[in-house]
Every structure is written in C-alpha cells, then in structure tokens.
Amino acid sequence: PEPPTACREKQYLINSQCCSLCQPGQKLVSDCTEFTETECLPCGESEFLDTWNRETHCHQHKYCDPNLGLRVQQKGTSETDTICTCEEGWHCTSEACESCVLHRSCSPGFGVKQIATGVSDTICEPCPVGFFSNVSSAFEKCHPWTSCETKDLVVQQAGTNKTDVVCGPQDRLRA
C-alpha cells in the first residue's frame, strides 16, 4: 500500500507511518513501528502536558512564588499547569501572572470606577461636579455633595472635587 501523506486526528506522521499521539499527561518515549504501538510515559509529579502530543519532555508546573505576591488559584495536574493569581490587594503585572504589584489607590479628587481584581488594576475617574473624594483609596467611589436643602440648611461653603459642601443655618428674616 501507498505510504500515507496525512494522518487521522490524534496521530502523527513519522517514517511514512501514522503513529498515535500521546494523551495529555503523558510524554513520548518511542515512536511506533510497523510492529509496535507508540510508547508513552506519564509525566512526573509537578510536570504536565495539556494536549495530545509527541513531546519527549513534560513541562514543569508554574511556581506561584509567595515572595512575588503570588498564590495558587488552581493546582497543577498531569494535564494542566498551575494557575497563579495575586494575594488580596495585589494584581498581576502580565497575563501570564508572573509577579504582582499593589493595587493603585485613587487620589483625592478621584473615585474608584472599577475595583481591582487579581488580574486588573484599580480604574479611577475624576469626581464630576456635585461629587467629591477627600481620601486616597482603592475602594472608595466619589461621594455626592451633602444636600443642604434637604436638611433645611444653606450652603456656607461650596464643595469641590476634594471637599464636601459646608452647610449652615439659614439667616432668620428680621421683623
């Protein structure tokens, strides 16, 4: 018969022959022959391969180094790598999450638009007219100015993006 030029899914072509790929979690020891099947071996502890493959070496699990602010989100297995995330208050510096940095705080005059997660930083926004923030915080949104009218008071000092309005008593009308 003619030697194949293409192989089925989960097979690979070698020496004009279709051999079975090794399943996830196993590495290739020897290619198949006319008389023998592909020989595969399980990955060692703390190693993995996540696809049907013909790799001769397994990949090492990622180490979520606590000294870099990392912690394990999902433990590695023979078929999957370890997934790292950051300790609370920190977020990954890259998609691969190889290290972490402290969440940014929003300065006075700015409020938190989106709270940071393990993978994204704090998003700040300037406090619009009618709102203020007088603290540096990674959690606080802009607060609305106090409504003096609802307290039967008048504005004594105007608010800014960093300060609340100051309310005071209304001047009594003289007889």
Epitope: P24, G25, P42, C43, G44, E45, S46, E47, D50, Q60, H61, Y63, C64, R71, V72, Q73, Q74, K75, G76, T77, S78, E79, T80, D81
Partner: antibody, heavy 119, light 113 residues
Framework: EVQLVKSGGGLVKPGGSLRLSCAAS????????MHWVRQAPGKGLEWVAY????????YYADTVKGRFTISRDNAKNSLYLQMNSLRAEDTALYYC????????????WGQGTLVTVSS | DIVMTQSPDSLAVSLGERVTMSCKSS????????????LTWHQQKPGQPPKLLIY???TRESGVPDRFSGSGSGTDFTLTISSLQAEDVAVYYC?????????FGGGTKVEIK
C-alpha cells in the same frame, strides 16, 4: 511495601524548636511530592506544607508560614519539617503523606508523630 | 481559602444499611483544563492515619470496596456506603485538592447503631 516512618516528635516549650523527619521506603521517593498534615488531639485534619518531588515548589499554610520549613533529601529518601517559634496551638499529631503525579492526591499517609508544645 | 463543610457531624446506622454523607465547598473544585472535580475523600479509623478512599470526586482508590461511591460536582459532593460493614466505622473527611491551601472538612463520624 510503602512505608513512611516518622521521628523527632516530643515535648517542647512555647517558643522552642523541633525537627521532624519522615523516612520513606518501598517506593521511589524522588518521584513523589510530599505533604505534612497535622491533627490536634480529638480534632480534624489541617494541611501544613507541601514540597514537590524535585524540591522546586514549596507551599505553606498561613498558620505556619515564616515559622516552619519543609525540606527533603532525595538521596536519603527523607522528608523534614523544621518547626521554630512553636506555640501551644501547634500541638498535634503530625503526618507525612505522599502525592503522586497522576491522582494529585495524598495517596499514602504515614503513622503520626506527636508534638506537644507546653510549658 | 476554600471552606469545606461536612454534614452530618456523626451518624449511627445499622449494619447492612445505606450511609450517605454530604460535603460542600465554598467555591467550585472543577479544574477548567481537564474538567475533573478535585474533591478527595479520606477514611480515618480509630488510632490509624487517614487512608485515601476516593479521588476526582468518584474514582475509587485501588483496593477500596465497591460499596463506597462518590458523586457530585462543582460545590456539592456526596459519599455513599451502600451497605455498612463493621470495618467501615471511621471518620470520613472530604478534602479540597483543587487549590492551596489544601483544606479538609470537619469530618463525619460513622458508628454502628
């Protein structure tokens, strides 16, 4: 036959130190990750620390971080737990357990060694 | 940390009767890469170290009698003993094997009525 034999337990004063050992036999020690798990008298199980087969990866429970150190010597088929700044709440039976590269579970536990922290 | 909650704390059942115990995790134990739930059950008989019973939620460890079965997914898991034998008297612990820190449930103590 798989065996995990402990030594090093005993009575120690608060603030003191102790080193536990776990000697492995009956399997290829260097192929397995290893854990320490403890059990306070009459209580449940609490994971303490893990070390990967090749020494590259180490994780600790927050309760022991900075005080306990897990290590291994594959040439001697031995696992260790160095315990410093011991507290009364560290009093427990300490087990070593192995983790293989297939199940990723603690598939064999040794007999425990008792650590008592008391003045 | 993942909190594992077991119920009941203890139960007394007649020999030959069915035993069911529950384990709930505070977050999913499903590995997104291989679609396995990393929930493990250990059996601890009085005066002995724990022994692996079931891993990946429902796979029995070699040598474990088939009267033991595990089920569940995500955050809700169950261990069943189809017909209780005298040698099954023990405390059964479920364990999060999904992430570090590894965490255990408080245990369910099984006794004979």
């Amino acid at each position: 036959e798989v065996q995990l034999v402990k030594s090093g337990g005993g009575l120690v004063k608060p603030g003191g130190s102790l080193r536990l050992s776990c000697a492995a036999s009956g399997f290829t020690f260097s192929d397995y990750g290893m854990h320490w798990v403890r059990q306070a008298p009459g209580k449940g199980l609490e994971w303490v620390a893990y070390i990967s087969s090749g020494n590259r990866i180490i994780y600790y429970a927050d309760t022991v971080k900075g005080r306990f150190t897990i290590s291994r010597d594959n040439a001697k088929n031995s696992l260790y737990l160095q315990m410093n700044s011991l507290r009364a709440e560290d009093t427990a039976l300490y087990y070593c357990a192995r983790q293989d590269g297939y199940r990723y579970a603690m598939d064999y536990w040794g007999q425990g060694t008792l650590v008592t922290v008391s003045s | 940390d993942i909190v594992m909650t077991q119920s009941p704390d203890s139960l007394a059942v007649s020999l030959g009767e069915r035993v069911t115990m529950s384990c709930k995790s505070s977050q999913s134990l499903l590995n997104s890469g291989n679609q396995k739930n990393y929930l493990t059950w250990h059996q601890q008989k009085p005066g002995q170290p724990p022994k692996l019973l079931i891993y990946w939620t429902s796979t029995r460890e070699s040598g474990v009698p088939d009267r033991f079965s595990g089920s569940g997914s995500g955050t809700d898991f169950t261990l069943t003993i189809s017909s209780l034998q005298a040698e099954d008297v023990a405390v059964y612990y479920c364990q999060n094997d999904y992430t570090y820190p590894l965490t255990f449930g408080g245990g369910t103590k099984v006794e004979i009525k």
